[in-house]
């Protein structure tokens, strides 16, 4: 059974991750200029079902293509470079989902933009954090 | 300007495995954001998106061919490859290599090959 | 698997001839659809991205519009070079699928 420090870990790494999103997302919602079109082309695939924390694997799956699309805005919204960026969410993630069972992601058939990936898990982050207080 | 060209036999017997090679020249296939597909086109048909591969390695298939699709890449060469396992007749088409940016339009093609399924 | 259905699937006309082929979606794929032409021994290639985003070189006699379900290519003037294979793609839902396509002769 987790222990209440084991949850605590897992509870602040759900909210770093959350912020990081957060940040990324409102990066691309500041940013104007033509590139957002193309940003917005690139399609992103969803998880068919995100409730535990074995379903990071899908996020993990998508955040080399995420690195990309953020490499195109070359922006200053972000305070840290997207690979940087990346690098820090990829480590939460490992963490969170754990690496003792293989989880092989099942996708949605429908795919989704930057801002709706980013959205879906926002979601998932602030729904692991209610179940966990 | 990227080219893809195909390479492979062009006849290949049933129940065994067709396989083909897509190589790229004029850019890198490590390029981010960029998906190396496989279409194929059976004779007077339609086209038929059989899968991707990213060049970390990451795969997409055609749900309808997942089960015998196996597609990889070999950065070092410039290079990814098709494997299509127990084929048969209907497998007869033109296979063409195609890039894409973020899974969306599938801008450079190559010239396609044609694989014939025959004993 | 999303259907995607042309019309029509042949058509004949001639030089100067306003042409529009029509696709359809069998779900809403918002505005991920794209338009090829394939001439005979030829690979495809893409003309419209996004239904209505030109991809660069492409004639601007050529353009394309309509989101959901319903798109239109649309040829405002035929050239003789234009006579060819048109498809139209989705790309909104795995796996990515093609309509069965146009044929474009002359008249």
């Known amino acids: 059974a987790p222990t209440s420090s084991s949850t605590k870990k897992t509870q602040l790494q759900l909210e770093h991750l959350l912020l990081d999103l957060q940040m990324i997302l409102n990066g691309i919602n500041n940013y104007k200029n033509p590139k957002l079109t193309r940003m917005l082309t690139f399609k992103f695939y969803m998880p068919k079902k995100a409730t535990e924390l074995k379903h990071l694997q899908c996020l993990e799956e998508e955040l080399k293509p995420l690195e990309e699309v953020l490499n195109l805005a070359q922006s200053k919204n972000f305070h840290l470079r997207p690979r940087d960026l990346i690098s820090n969410i990829n480590v939460i993630v490992l963490e969170l989902k754990g690496s003792e069972t293989t989880f092989m992601c099942e996708y949605a058939d429908e795919t989704a933009t930057i801002v709706e990936f980013l959205n879906r898990w926002i979601t998932f982050c602030q729904s692991i954090i209610s179940t966990l207080t | 300007q990227v080219q893809l060209q195909e390479s492979g036999p062009g006849l290949v017997k049933p129940s065994q495995t067709l396989s083909l090679t897509c190589t790229v020249s004029?850019?890198?296939?490590?390029?981010?954001?960029?998906?190396w597909n496989w279409i194929r086109q059976h004779p007077g048909k339609g086209l038929e998106w059989i899968g991707y591969?990213?060049?970390?390695?990451?795969?997409h298939y055609n749900p309808s061919l997942k089960s015998r699709v196996t597609i990889s890449v070999d950065t070092s060469k410039n290079q990814f490859s098709l494997k299509l396992s127990s084929v048969i007749a209907a497998d007869t088409a033109v296979y063409y290599c195609?890039?894409?940016?973020?899974?969306?339009?599938?801008?450079?093609w190559g010239q396609g090959t044609m694989v014939t399924v025959s004993s | 698997d999303i259907q995607m259905t042309q019309s029509p699937s042949s058509l004949s006309a001639s030089v100067g001839d306003r042409v529009t082929i029509t696709c359809r979606a069998s779900?809403?794929?918002?505005?991920?659809l794209n338009w090829y032409q394939q001439k005979p021994g030829k690979a495809p290639k893409v003309l419209i991205y996004?239904?209505?985003s030109f991809q660069s070189g492409v004639p601007s006699r050529f353009s394309g519009s309509g989101s959901g379900t319903d798109f239109t290519l649309t040829i405002s003037s035929l050239q003789p070079e234009d006579f060819a294979t048109y498809y139209c793609?989705?790309?909104?839902?795995?796996?990515?699928?093609f309509g069965q396509g146009t044929k474009v002769e002359i008249k």
């Open positions: 195609a890039r894409d940016w973020g899974r969306d339009a599938f801008d450079i």
């Open positions: 996004a239904a209505s």
């Open positions: 004029g850019g890198s296939i490590s390029s981010g954001g960029y998906y």
């Open positions: 793609q989705q790309s909104h839902y795995i796996p990515r699928t």
């Open positions: 591969i990213y060049y970390s390695g990451n795969t």
């Open positions: 779900q809403t794929i918002s505005s991920y």
